[in-house]
């Protein structure tokens, strides 16, 4: 037995026939000694005298809230519930299986942006006698602390014959950094209490991997002359994470009838405009996904065919680009060949993903697993690759981006990726560690020489131990590749010469 | 399934037109683009335009802009390229294909060899 | 328009090996980009589309990777009938285009 809060507590339950249950013993919160009687609920009957009162608890009907008191007067409340557990697992009646993105997936969260605010949402059948209560942290080890809203009734649906009621949440983490590559992964964890049944689920989650932005903005068309073609030009979201230079999205453009068995026209941009061919009664959508990270696209945002909205041009290209200097990032500190990182780094994420697209979709977090990716190098809140710390001086973000390439082209060089199951040299590991170690390269030139991070002694003996390992690098590295995309990215727009 | 079958060799004399066709079975016509790509022999590939059945829209590559013309006849499911002022560098093959994206091509016709020769 | 430069224009592979397949664009083209087979005598086979999206009932062992301007065609173990040549074609802009072709032969 455990106190939820104040007067409640949750009795755990192995739930079998002829269980013998748990013995609860509660005590009456009174200075008062004597003359003190128990009941349960709305009901008359005394179960027992005294300041304490054992009972033992089976099943629902032993469950509820015990009250005592004394000549008449309530001395004080305990509310029972009950926390089932049927062949070793939690009951999880309460909360609908979503089966989205796998099976056993109870609560969904998405965030529109990286400023540390993200929604989750749950569906239940039941309309009455329902509360929930989340809390949330970062990690869970030495938590960091998330504020989370009251959950609320956000939507009902008819699906069949049942009524479904989502809920929601917002959470906020108290000190955000956008920027960052997150090394800690958010703790939801969500209590719901049905009549007297108690239930908790939980997720775990990094922000990066619940992204899903708003559709684009304000969708232009400006019909081509003696074409066919349509230029059309949109906006990043307003809720979208800024400076656009940093916080880059690739685009997908689509022409489409109303029916998705309908043809339809078809191009991807990291731009803000593109030219597609328009034809009647067919629509015009965008929808936008993060540039450097495979996280969800957002939903389809459309506009018409027919009527080609304004003719304004709009061809702004969401911020990328920019000329680059030839020079490299020495020690001394000059600028690195920004335009070329930009484009070595882009073909990082882009590698790191083909690596091993299964592995976006894997749930790797196990027991353990938070210490086994504390040994790889993370770029934290404190190294300057956010936009302002790159304004201020690049070389600090460079040197632990450096340190990073290094760290992993070893990783990807050592057993773990050389020894069994092999891989060859020209897959796409053996490609993203030719460009790893190209881009670390770039940024220093021999000769000259940064601090590099120890690679730590993981030699896993068994070859699907190394395969969850590959598994577990790739992913961190697809993190780590993003943020140095977004830098350099960054660095081409505003910091070249 | 869906097939493109397209009509046989020609011979031709430079100055002249070639009317090619390819008729498409296995799917509702209108329902996806026709393209017209040719292979010149030894050569690689080269896109020549794309037709869309249902309005009779068009967009030819510029470098066949005003020599090229493609139409379809929703009556018989079939498509035709007719290519005007041959000039001997117009020998190849000419594929016609079919998909309901507008930038690939995904069902192929067999090829039909066009030679320009005097 | 924009130019398609696929390289080597030969490649010698003895079956059962890997073989990678280079495809660059003048300009940035994102992810749109297509892989296609064409043996002697036959039209073209579509294998790859949007840089790494398969179709289905082409063989696992040919997966596309790449953006921007770089573009990867890898076959994991080649098989006799891989032997053939094979093109990459944009579409991120009209006129579409292709490129040269590699050409890929028993080593």
């Known amino acids: 037995i455990w106190e939820l809060k104040k007067d409640v507590y949750v009795v755990e339950l192995d739930w079998y026939p002829d269980a013998p249950g748990e013995m609860v013993v509660l005590t009456c919160d009174t200075p008062e000694e004597d003359g003190i009687t128990w009941t349960l609920d709305q009901s008359s009957e005394v179960l027992g005298s005294g300041k304490t009162l054992t009972i033992q608890v089976k099943e629902f009907g032993d469950a509820g809230q015990y009250t005592c008191h004394k000549g008449g007067e309530v001395l004080s409340h305990s509310l029972l519930l009950l926390h089932k557990k049927e062949d070793g697992i939690w009951s999880t009646d309460i909360l609908k299986d979503q089966k989205e993105p796998k099976n056993k997936t109870f609560l969904r969260c998405e965030a529109k942006n990286y400023s540390g605010r993200f929604t989750c949402w749950w569906l239940t059948t039941i309309s009455t006698d329902l509360t929930f209560s989340v809390k949330s942290s970062r990690g869970s080890s030495d938590p960091q602390g998330v504020t989370c809203g009251a959950a609320t009734l956000s939507a009902e649906r008819v699906r069949g014959d049942n009524k479904e009621y989502e809920y929601s949440v917002e959470c906020q983490e108290d000190s955000a950094c956008p920027a960052a590559e997150e090394s800690l992964p958010i703790e939801v964890m969500v209590d719901a209490v049905h009549k007297l049944k108690y239930e908790n689920y939980t997720s775990s989650f990094f922000i990066r991997d619940i992204i899903k932005p708003d559709p684009p903005k304000n969708l232009q068309l400006k019909p081509l002359k003696n074409s066919r073609q349509v230029e059309v030009s949109w906006e990043y979201p307003d809720t979208w994470s800024t400076p656009h230079s940093y916080f880059s999205l690739t685009f997908c453009v689509q022409v489409q009838g109303k029916s998705a068995r309908e043809k339809k026209d078809r191009v991807f941009t990291d731009k803000t405009s593109a030219t597609v061919i328009c034809r009647k009664n067919a629509s015009i959508s965008v929808r936008a996904q993060d540039r450097y990270y495979s996280s969800s696209w957002s939903e389809w945002a459309s506009v018409p065919c027919s009527g080609s909205g304004s003719s304004r041009g709009g061809s702004g290209s969401g911020g990328s680009g920019g000329g680059g200097s030839k020079l490299r990032a020495v020690p001394g500190g000059s600028s690195p060949a920004w335009t070329q990182c930009q484009q070595l780094s882009q073909k990082l994420c882009t590698l790191a993903w083909s690596a091993h697209p299964l592995v976006g979709h894997m749930d790797l977090r196990e027991e353990g697993d938070e210490e086994t990716t504390n040994d790889v190098p993370h770029i934290q809140c404190g190294d300057g690759c956010d936009p302002q710390g790159l304004r201020d001086n690049s070389q600090f973000c460079l040197q632990r981006i450096h340190q990073g390439l290094i760290f992993y082209e070893k990783l990807l060089g050592s057993d773990i990726f050389t020894g069994e199951p092999s891989l060859l040299p020209d897959s796409p590991v053996g490609q993203l560690h030719a460009s790893l170690l190209g881009l670390s390269q770039l940024l220093q030139p021999e000769g000259h020489h940064w601090e590099t991070q120890q690679i730590p002694s993981l030699s896993p003996s068994q070859p699907w131990q190394r395969l969850l390992l590959r598994f577990k690098i790739l992913r961190s590295l697809q993190a780590f590749v993003a943020v140095a995309a977004r830098v350099f990215a960054h660095g081409a727009a505003t910091l070249s010469p | 399934q869906v097939q493109l079958v397209q009509s046989g060799a020609e011979v031709k004399k430079p100055g002249a037109s070639v009317k090619v066709s390819c008729k498409a079975s296995g799917y509702t016509f209108t329902d996806y683009y026709l393209h017209w790509v040719r292979q010149a022999p030894g050569q690689g590939l080269e896109w020549m335009g794309w037709i869309d059945p249902e309005n009779g829209d068009t967009e030819y590559a510029p470098k066949f802009q005003g020599r090229v013309t493609m139409t379809t006849d929703t009556s018989t499911s079939t498509a035709y390229m007719e290519l005007r002022s041959l000039r001997s560098d117009d020998t190849a093959v000419y594929y016609c294909?079919?998909?309901?994206?507008?930038?690939?091509?995904?069902?192929w016709g067999q090829g039909t060899m066009v030679t320009v020769s005097s | 328009e924009i130019v398609m430069t696929q390289s080597p224009a030969t490649l010698s592979v003895s079956p059962g090996e890997r073989a990678t397949l280079s495809c660059r664009a003048s300009q940035s083209i994102s992810i749109n980009l297509h892989w296609y087979q064409q043996k002697p005598g036959q039209a073209p086979r579509l294998l790859i589309y949007f840089a790494s999206q398969s179709i289905s009932g082409i063989p696992a062992r040919f997966s596309g990777s790449g953006s921007g301007t770089e573009f990867t065609l890898t076959i994991s173990s080649l098989q006799s009938e891989d032997f053939a040549v094979y093109y990459c074609q944009q579409s991120n802009s009209f006129p579409l285009t292709f490129g040269g072709g590699t050409k890929v032969e028993i080593k």
């Open positions: 294909n079919a998909n309901k994206e507008l930038r690939y091509f995904d069902v």
